[in-house]
């Protein structure tokens, strides 16, 4: 028995760790799933942040783990990405769905960021150069589409390289290799890590390495 309080909780189940798996919501004392109609990275970002796994990695249209059971609580979830909880996103109404089955249970993959790395290369020091990120064991780059000083500020702060002095595109620090991990990132400049900016998903891009982005931070400029 419970006495008042919010009657909603969120968890990820049957994943590799606490930051991945099938999305389940507890509403009115009952755990249920979320249908994948309209599933998006914005919804995943909200879930990851809510669960203290701030890095949204991907939004599988279905739970890669086993299908859930019980009620399907949410469908057509539409988030802006800045909501504090999944239930602040728009949806069809609690328990309302368009003939979803548990084969359509939504899943997410988040990360606490501990397995991610970032570095600047080919700039002459650790605080300037081409942006490279290590994800899933592979180093890759960031596309310059819509890259701006806010992105650079996040990177410089994250690398403890002071403030952002400038940013560049068009592979100003040479063309990288491997995956292009990010494209069209949206940062407000206050994020604690570049991967906490809004993005369309890891490895989703329409770029080539001629568009690799770079930055120069204040500590790097001092060393030049």
């Amino acid at each position: 028995s419970s006495l008042g309080g919010t009657d909603k909780e969120l968890r990820l189940v049957d994943g590799e760790n606490k930051c991945s798996g099938r999305v389940e919501v507890k509403v009115q004392e009952e755990w249920g799933t979320v249908c994948n109609n309209g599933w998006s990275m914005e919804a995943v970002s909200v879930i990851c942040n809510q669960l203290g796994c701030p890095t949204a990695i991907k939004a599988p249209g279905w739970a890669n783990s086993s299908a859930g059971s019980g009620r399907i609580w949410m469908d057509h979830v539409s988030c802006r990405g800045n909501e504090s909880a999944l239930w602040d996103c728009k949806h069809d109404g609690w328990g309302k769905h368009s003939n979803c089955t548990h084969q359509q249970d939504a899943g997410v993959t988040c990360s606490d960021g501990s397995n991610l790395e970032m570095r600047l290369t080919r700039g002459g020091n650790m605080c300037s150069g081409r942006i490279e990120i290590k994800f899933q064991g592979r180093w890759g780059t960031v596309c310059d589409d819509n890259f701006n000083i806010d992105h650079a500020s996040v990177i410089c702060r994250q690398l403890e390289c002071g403030s952002a002095v400038s940013f560049s595109g068009s592979s100003n620090f040479g063309e990288g290799s491997g995956p292009i991990w990010f494209d069209d990132l949206i940062c407000n400049g206050n994020e604690s890590a570049l991967w906490n900016c809004k993005h369309q998903g890891w490895g989703k891009h329409n770029c080539d390495h001629a568009e690799d982005a770079g930055v120069i931070c204040s500590k790097g400029a001092d060393l030049s």
Epitope: S1, S2, G4, G5, T6, D7, K8, V27, Q28, E29, E30, R71, W87, D88, C89, K90, H91, D92, G93, W94, G95, K96
Partner: antibody, heavy 116, light 107 residues
Framework: DVQLQESGPGLVKPSQSLSLTCTVT?????????WNWIRQFPGNKLEWMGY???????NYNPSLKSQISITRDTSKNQFFLQLNSVTTEDTATYYC?????????WGQGTTLTVSS | DIVMTQSPSSLSASVGDRVTITCRAS??????VAWFQQKPGKSPKPLIY???SLQSGVPSRFSGSGSGTDFTLTISSLQAEDFAVYFC?????????FGGGTKLEIK
Amino acid sequence: DVQLQESGPGLVKPSQSLSLTCTVTGYSITSDYAWNWIRQFPGNKLEWMGYITYSGITNYNPSLKSQISITRDTSKNQFFLQLNSVTTEDTATYYCVSGTYYFDYWGQGTTLTVSS
Amino acid sequence: DIVMTQSPSSLSASVGDRVTITCRASQSVSSDVAWFQQKPGKSPKPLIYYASSLQSGVPSRFSGSGSGTDFTLTISSLQAEDFAVYFCGQDYTSPRTFGGGTKLEIK
């Protein structure tokens, strides 16, 4: 279709316990839904009191503290509201209400007067 | 508890009028607001759930809107059978709470 029918004593003395019954037809209370009690005071103010889910879990309005208990008898397809130590402030129309999450199905209500 | 403040408390209108009733929550309730209609001697009838979704069988002249803290119930063209008391309620968190009601009367 789900139909709910409240029944109760109509008149109760202060400090006594109140027991109301909701008889459900057309649907099993163990199949689905939350089974709520809501009351409406003179002057129209509505107050959600609590529910018992189809699986038997209860949740109560904290304002009623330890005064309230909601139970059920699955064999009779009924659920119950017990309110201890009633006062004249508990005079109201009591509704049993159900739905998956929303208050979709309402009984017609039973009026309770607390008076000596 | 979340307080739902409804306005106006009473309203006079004529058949054919467009009528708007508002409800304000003391904190954000996302879109988790429902609207009910109650006629004398009857139980409340659900009209709208999740701020803007019409309950089955409810005429399309009823509509709801809003999110966060401010919500509206609109009757586009008032019919004789619409004169009643209307309540909002929040479904966002426990305990569920209701507005004080708006009595819609014939002018």
